[in-house]
């Protein structure tokens, strides 16, 4: 059972009049513009900035008063500012959505340290993992390392978006006062949706006597 609660002063259940609501989309997948209405009799128009209107055809684009506009396989045409409009009692209401295309491509993953890493016991280990992706891509970066169960490492993350062609994600792993138990394989794993890449390096610990 779906119940409409009619409100003449608020035709849309969620109103984003000033700041658009961000909707993440993937080309070829279903995209819902969730401008559901407070009454099934409200006529809604879906506009694409700057000068177009999407026409529901009952196939690729469907209007459902309980959900909004359902686009069965989104294309590049739906990227940008989309506005749902409804006129109630002579008053025009608008709710705005900004579609953001997400890609899942990981171009490259590197650990910017010589391999294998040779370190004196008691010194600090710093490993910098760098993931390069196209714009509009987000990634999750995780580390696995020998003494992970004791949470020996601290990890800092940052994004460099100054490049006009790519995003560069950094994950910096730091372990203070390295001990023998910290030696072994260090792996940086990068995931974006279904895409996955990893890179690893071996860390060797030496006493001063053996240098």
């Amino acid at each position: 059972i779906y119940i409409f609660i009619s409100d003449t002063g608020r035709p849309f259940v969620e109103m984003y009049s000033e700041i658009p609501e961000i909707i993440h989309m993937t080309e070829g997948r279903e995209l819902v513009i969730p401008c559901r209405v407070t009454s099934p009799n409200i006529t809604v128009t879906l506009k694409k900035f700057p000068l177009d209107t999407l026409i529901p055809d009952g196939k690729r684009i469907i209007w459902d008063s309980r959900k909004g506009f359902i686009i069965s396989n989104a294309t590049y045409k739906e990227i940008g500012l989309l506005t749902c409009e409804a006129t109630v009692n002579g008053h025009l209401y608008k709710t705005n959505y900004l579609t953001h295309r997400q890609t899942n491509t990981i171009i490259d993953v590197q650990i910017s340290t010589p391999r294998p890493v040779k370190l004196l016991r008691g010194h600090t280990l710093v490993l910098n993992c760098t993931a390069t992706t196209p714009l509009n891509t987000r990634v999750q970066m995780t580390w696995s390392y020998p003494d992970e169960k004791n949470k020996r490492a601290s990890v800092r993350r940052r994004i460099d978006q100054s490049n006009s062609h790519a995003n560069i994600f950094y994950s910096v792993l730091t372990i203070d006062k390295m001990q023998n138990k910290d030696k072994g394989l260090y792996t940086c794993r990068v995931r974006s949706g279904p895409s996955f890449k990893s890179v690893n390096t071996s860390v060797h610990i030496y006493d001063k006597a053996f240098i």
Epitope: T43, L51, D52, T53, L54, I55, P56, D57, W63
Partner: antibody, heavy 121, light 106 residues
Framework: EVQLVESGGDLVKPGGSLKLSCAAS????????MSWVRQTPDKRLEWVAT????????YYSDSVEGRFTISRDNANNTLFLQMSSLKSEDTAMFYC??????????????WGQGTSVTVSS | DIQMTQSPSSLSASLGGKVTITCKTS??????IAWYQHKPGKGPRLLIH???TLQPGIPSRFSGSGSGRDYSFSISNLEPEDIATYYC????????FGGGTKLEIK
């Protein structure tokens, strides 16, 4: 007053091409989706093609897909239908119609008087 | 695509009388049904949209009803200017017209 005036209809041989035009006035053309609908000699109405207000979205019936192209010139308030590889079964009166939003979906609300297309050798 | 079966294909009625035309769709059209009047030499004229809503300026002698797959259109108190062919249209899934009903006055 909404006015739609079609032109360009003619007698054409099978396999030939023809371009229809529809001059619009009395409303904000650039805000309106538009369609072409034809009436066959047996008086049946058949939807042919539709274009969104900005021209970014086009829709075609299976019978004309790949042969006909709908387009528009918003600066000059004109709708077009480029027809190629014409067949005898394309013989019809072609109407242009404005779309109106009725409950979230679009129906044709205003129509022109039509232009006649005959495909015959 | 949705198919539309309109009946009857023609009918004759007396002035002042009432006629009813029906349209059956091959699948639920969610009330997205319109009715048109078409006279020779002119373009079709929209009378009713969304099953039962009269267009501005259309007399209340015209009416529509229905839901799901079954829809009907009626003209009461028939007048001479009602002589025309009437068409239904479903606009829920692309656009499909009924075959038309030619109305004559006895």
């Amino acid at each position: 007053e909404v006015q739609l005036v079609e032109s360009g209809g003619d007698l054409v041989k099978p396999g030939g091409s023809l371009k229809l035009s529809c001059a619009a006035s009395g409303f904000t053309f650039s805000d309106s989706g538009m369609s072409w609908v034809r009436q066959t000699p047996d008086k049946r109405l058949e939807w042919v093609a539709t274009i969104s207000s900005g021209g970014g979205y086009t829709y075609y019936s299976d019978s004309v897909e790949g042969r006909f192209t709908i387009s528009r010139d918003n600066a000059n308030n004109t709708l077009f239908l480029q027809m190629s590889s014409l067949k005898s079964e394309d013989t019809a009166m072609f109407y242009c119609a404005r779309l109106g939003n009725y409950g979230g979906y679009y129906g044709m609300d205003y129509w022109g008087q039509g232009t006649s297309v005959t495909v015959s050798s | 695509d949705i198919q539309m079966t309109q009946s009857p294909s023609s009918l004759s009625a007396s002035l002042g009388g009432k006629v009813t035309i029906t349209c059956k769709t091959s699948q639920d059209s969610n009330k997205y049904i319109a009715w048109y009047q078409h006279k020779p030499g002119k373009g079709p004229r929209l009378l009713i949209h969304y099953t039962s809503t009269l267009q501005p300026g259309i007399p209340s002698r015209f009416s529509g009803s229905g839901s799901g797959r079954d829809y009907s259109f009626s003209i009461s108190n028939l007048e001479p200017e009602d002589i025309a062919t009437y068409y239904c249209l479903q606009y829920d899934n692309l656009w499909t017209f009924g075959g038309g009903t030619k109305l004559e006055i006895k």
